[in-house]
């Protein structure tokens, strides 16, 4: 075992001479992003105050390519890098095409309406006049491709004019536009060369040791890894912590059970029920508030102030009133819970599926006619699964090195 341990220690660290370095640099696991949209079936009725009715559409599947660049080894046992992602639509794996039309809340209109609720009335009027002149409406009928990667909307220019510096979009707006062909921030992580216990842990993100999106030091902490590999020699007492730039926060997953993936022993880590719990149910999450019902996290502070919420798909593990407020939601543990299967000896993921939902809080805002008589509701926009499983040559090498060889050596 000590010989195996030495081999693992030598080969998991982030060092050009280690076996896993190329695996770390260019992840050989094929990743897929599967997106499911909530098609709004009764937009006119919602504007009259009726309960929203949605139908899940998808999956629309994209192959996700990741590569690290600007890799710089620092002299404090850390390495800095940018990781770029590109997405390629996979028609054969998808249930529909990127040209499918989806009826969705108009995030720019309804988001701006909620944002303006407590703004001066004059600004509200200017925005209403503009919304009307520009033919904006509360719900839009757009293609999957437009929703994902961006569509031209005059409101982008309007918001940039009246809320300067707040909006990360220029000319086009798309929910995944910021992710495609771009990096997720400059990560600086420990290499494990000098101190293996800190391997993969994030030292800084974009030069920051902590973020300032939230209202408590604990919630602003950048904990864990960048979400791709973890320190080796895990036990069932270990937790899986990582910083997610998309969620603008650190997340901690807990050990659930042991298993086997293609002959390789794994630990399965899942989200605790408290991941998106509100502050009254789980006090450490108080810093993520102001909160609505438990089970959804307000990400407006890091998403251009729009009233956007992150949760498990179909409001799984959330306050039941959320799913009951929208017809067509069916939370299901099997289909909607996220998991990561990790090889505990190396801390390398074998199989994972991270599932999250993005929702919009919308309501009638007095003085903004476009919002009609909408009853306050957290309406799901889409949910996605980012999934990957080790396969092919990589899996064969991994199995040989970490399962077969130790067995042979043992005998």
């Amino acid at each position: 075992p000590s010989l195996i341990k030495q081999q693992v220690l030598k080969n998991v660290r982030i060092d050009p001479s280690s076996l896993s370095f190329n695996m770390w640099k260019e992840i050989p696991i094929p990743f897929y992003l599967s997106v499911y949209f909530f098609d709004v079936m009764n937009p006119s009725e919602i504007l009259k105050g009726e309960k929203p009715q949605v139908r899940e559409r998808g999956p629309y599947v994209y192959r996700e390519f990741r590569h690290k660049s600007n890799i710089t080894f620092n002299n404090n046992d850390t390495v800095s890098f940018l990781e770029y992602r590109t997405f390629q639509f996979q028609p054969s794996k998808s249930h529909g095409s990127e040209s499918d039309y989806i009826v969705m809340p108009n995030i720019l209109v309804l988001g701006a309406a909620v944002m303006m609720e407590n703004k001066p009335m004059t600004l509200k009027l200017i925005m209403t006049l503009a919304f009307t002149t520009l033919g904006e409406r509360a719900f839009m009928n757009r293609t999957v491709g437009e929703i994902m990667w961006g569509y031209k909307d005059p409101l982008v220019n309007l918001i940039n004019k009246y809320f300067p510096g707040m909006f990360p979009f220029k000319d086009k707006f798309g929910l995944f536009a910021e992710l495609n062909n771009s990096d997720s921030g400059l990560f600086t992580v420990f290499t494990g060369v000098q101190n293996i216990s800190r391997i993969h842990l994030v030292d800084k993100w974009n030069g920051l040791s902590k973020v300032d999106f939230w209202h408590s030091d604990q919630c602003n902490m950048i904990n864990g890894t960048s979400g791709q590999m973890w320190p080796p020699f895990m036990t069932p007492e270990s937790s899986l912590e990582f910083y997610s730039p998309e969620a603008c926060r650190s997340m901690k997953l807990m050990y659930k059970e042991s298993g086997v993936f293609e002959g390789i022993p794994t630990y399965r880590f899942v989200a605790p029920k408290t991941l998106f719990a509100n502050g009254s149910i789980y006090p450490p999450n108080e810093g993520f508030c102001p909160c609505l019902e438990s089970g959804i996290q307000n990400v407006s502070t890091c998403r251009f102030s729009a009233p956007l919420f992150l949760s498990h798909p179909h409001f799984l593990n959330a306050d039941p009133v959320l799913a009951e407020a929208v017809t067509g939601l069916h939370p299901n543990q099997e289909a909607h819970s996220l998991f990561l299967d990790i090889h505990p000896v190396t801390g390398i993921p074998m199989n994972c599926s991270v599932k999250l939902q993005l929702s919009l809080y919308m309501k009638s805002v007095a003085g903004i006619g476009q919002t009609g008589k909408i009853e306050p509701v957290v309406l799901p926009l889409l949910w996605f699964a980012e999934s990957g499983a080790m396969e092919g040559e990589t899996l064969h090498t991994f199995y040989t090195q970490l399962v077969l060889m130790p067995k042979v050596m043992h005998y």
Epitope: K124, L125, I126, T132, T133, L134, P154, K161, G367
Partner: antibody, heavy 119, light 110 residues
Framework: EVQLVETGAEVKKPGSSVKVSCKAS????????IIWVRQAPGQGLEWMGG????????NYAQKFQGRVTITADDSTSTAYMELNDLRSEDTAVYYC????????????WGQGTLVTVSS | QSVLTQPPGASGAPGQRVTISCSGD????????VNWYQQVPGMAPKLLIY???QRPSGVPDRFSGSRSGTSASLAISGLQSEDEADYYC???????????FGGGTKVTVL
Amino acid sequence: EVQLVETGAEVKKPGSSVKVSCKASGDTLSSHAIIWVRQAPGQGLEWMGGIIPIFRTVNYAQKFQGRVTITADDSTSTAYMELNDLRSEDTAVYYCAKTLNEGLPWDYWGQGTLVTVSS
Amino acid sequence: QSVLTQPPGASGAPGQRVTISCSGDSSNIESYAVNWYQQVPGMAPKLLIYRDNQRPSGVPDRFSGSRSGTSASLAISGLQSEDEADYYCGSWDDNLNGPTFGGGTKVTVL
């Protein structure tokens, strides 16, 4: 059927004021903004200002600031535009307009009120 | 003086195609969608095209709109006698903080 009904034609002396009304029949005013637009003889359309009736919040075009007052009475579903210190160049047809069908910009207009300023 | 500039007149024989231009700048047409209104003499303006190229229900598909850079245009194909009217372009203007309109183009059917 929804209609925006405006007052009849008016003849005014320079320096005086005119108050034009716009009544929404078959609909309330409050939910959407109302704008006032004028059209001088042989000229284009010119925006004067807008109001959210429910709040009585008003936004005026710079050119008319201080001379125009737009108000609304939600109980009678009527909007008003008062223009002071009239000059001959204020001779125009004055329209009120609103959106009735969501997403259609200013798709409902009043029939217009001709205001003639003459000594 | 209108913020948006239109030619005063355009004409065509029945069945012909007529195009009307509308010119603005970065504070209006370049940044924002354009609407077109039709005004028959003695009547209130009527919405004809909105969001550059969308037609409200009831507007014939002979009418089409487009926008590029700081200008927009309205095309009437298969001109008919009832198309004789004034046509106004409209948009949002940042400097005005409100809607703005063109000076209008009188279309004559020869």
